[in-house]
């Protein structure tokens, strides 16, 4: 008896992080024996969509003409051949940006930092959020990912870096997100250029602890009260 059908490959073009309103195409590639392709979205009635294969039958296209919140999420695809259904593909996480207003990103005490010293990147959101992402331009993945462990929502998150080396230099942006869907991100913050001067070299960045801060009273929208160290935000290296 033949083994299970090989799992298909699932990917998105132009990528898996899409701005609100932009188009995206999801591709599922199986084998030449495929007769039908099925796309499932986590927490949606299955199947989310079915498509006939495109010639030469080894892949199918699922089109999203305008990205909205409803399309963000985790997808898997399958194909059916004469001997049955394949294994599921590895998951594709389709993320939408632009779900919330852009946070603001600051470098404290300054974006000009001497090698060997410390700097903290501060990401602040307009509304309380429980996830903050720090992205470095031209890095393959989010650099740091802070998420509340207890659903406690914060207006800001700190990303300390110490000691700073030349590796830390570059352009950063941050995003914020709500816990009910980590597939929905804010607009990106304006870019922050971190400039490292000096000759102390250490090839490996070593951020220290992370801190979140609760918002201040209503008449002080963005003058936060005292820091709350380790108040439920957990760091993930990605």
């Amino acid at each position: 008896q033949a083994g299970p059908l090989p799992k298909p490959t699932l990917w998105a073009e132009p990528g898996s992080v899409i701005s609100w309103g932009n188009s995206v195409t999801i591709w599922c590639q199986g084998t030449l024996e495929a007769r039908e392709y099925r796309l499932d979205k986590e927490e949606s009635p299955a199947p989310w969509d079915r498509q006939n294969p495109l010639e030469p039958k080894n892949k199918a296209r699922f089109s999203i003409p305008s990205m909205t919140e409803d399309y963000a999420g985790r997808y898997r695809c399958y194909y059916r051949s004469p001997v049955g259904w394949s294994q599921p593909s590895d998951p594709l996480e389709l993320v939408m940006t632009g779900a919330y207003s852009k946070p603001t990103l600051s470098a404290l005490p300054s974006p000009l930092v001497t090698s060997g010293k410390s700097v903290t990147l501060l990401c602040q959101s307009r509304s309380p959020m429980d996830t903050f992402l720090l992205i470095k331009e031209r890095a393959a993945h989010p650099l740091l990912h802070l998420r509340s462990e207890h659903g406690a929502q914060q207006h800001q998150a700190e990303f300390p870096m110490s000691p700073v080396t030349s590796v830390h230099g570059g352009t950063y942006r941050c995003f914020s997100s709500h816990g009910f869907s980590h597939y929905l991100l804010s607009h990106p913050s304006d870019p922050l250029e971190l400039i490292v001067s000096g000759s102390l070299e250490d090839p490996r960045p070593s951020p220290t602890r992370s801190v979140s801060t609760a918002a201040g009273p209503e008449d002080q929208p963005l003058m936060p009260t005292g820091s709350v160290p380790h108040s439920g935000l957990r760091r993930h290296w990605e």
């Epitope: 852009k102 600051s106 929208p221 963005l222 003058m223």
Partner: antibody, heavy 117, light 113 residues
């Protein structure tokens, strides 16, 4: 592109109420605060308050509290501002504006409300 | 409430010349948490809605010509138009977003001399 389209001009008598609408399009409606700003004829800008469409949270300028109510209809991506017990000083252009980070990056075209007996 | 005071109330400048508008707040708009100034500038042309020019006191909004520049810190801020164009005729407002209620300056009317 982001658009905020407001309802048309209104003429009201003193003591009456007016309800102005602001229909949003071109962005993710729920995730952005919408504020309302008053501009009397030939005068400056005055902040009235905001509503957060995601959860209906509101905050009003103390000066307008008790007379203003902001609501949202997520199904039509529309926010509303109702102002009651109108007086002649309420004659103004009322703007809705999308909040970026407590400042306003997009504005509606304005709705003229005239209060006259 | 934070009071925002602009000067002058009106200003006439020749085409191609520099225009300078000042804005003073009754308390500091500089946040100790992020070292940013919570101040924005808007342009309002006759019969139109305001348009965002500058936020964080000096960050130019996307699409705004680079002849517009914001500066200042704490309580004293300036909007500078380096070379006045005919289309810059408008009323300009500053706005603080350091604390509620959000407040605006009274406006400065900019005309061509």
């Amino acid at each position: 592109q982001v658009q905020l389209v407001q309802s048309g001009a209104e003429v009201k008598k003193p003591g009456a109420s007016v309800k102005v609408s602001c229909k949003a399009s071109g962005y993710s409606f729920s995730g952005f605060y919408i504020d309302w700003v008053k501009q009397p004829p030939g005068k400056g800008l005055e902040w009235i308050g905001y509503i957060f469409p995601s959860n209906g949270e509101t905050s009003y300028n103390q000066k307008f509290k008790g007379r203003v109510t902001m609501t949202v209809d997520k199904s039509t991506s529309t926010v509303y501002m109702e102002l009651s017990s109108l007086r002649s000083e309420d004659t103004a252009v009322y703007y809705c504006a999308r909040q970026a980070f407590y400042y306003f990056d997009y504005w509606g075209q304005g709705t003229t409300v005239t209060v006259s007996s | 409430d934070i009071v925002m005071t602009q000067s002058p109330d009106s200003l006439a400048v020749s085409l191609g010349e520099r225009a300078t508008i000042n804005c003073k707040s009754s308390q500091s708009l500089l946040s100790s948490s992020n070292q940013k100034n919570y101040l924005a500038w808007y342009q309002q042309k006759p019969g139109q809605a305001p348009r965002l020019l500058i936020y964080w006191a000096s960050t130019r909004e996307s699409g705004v010509p680079d002849r517009f520049a914001g500066s200042g810190s704490g309580t004293d801020f300036t909007l500078t138009i380096s070379s006045l164009q005919a289309e810059d005729v408008a009323v300009y407002y500053c706005q603080q977003y350091y604390s509620y209620p959000l407040t605006f300056g009274q406006g400065t009317k900019l005309e061509i001399k």
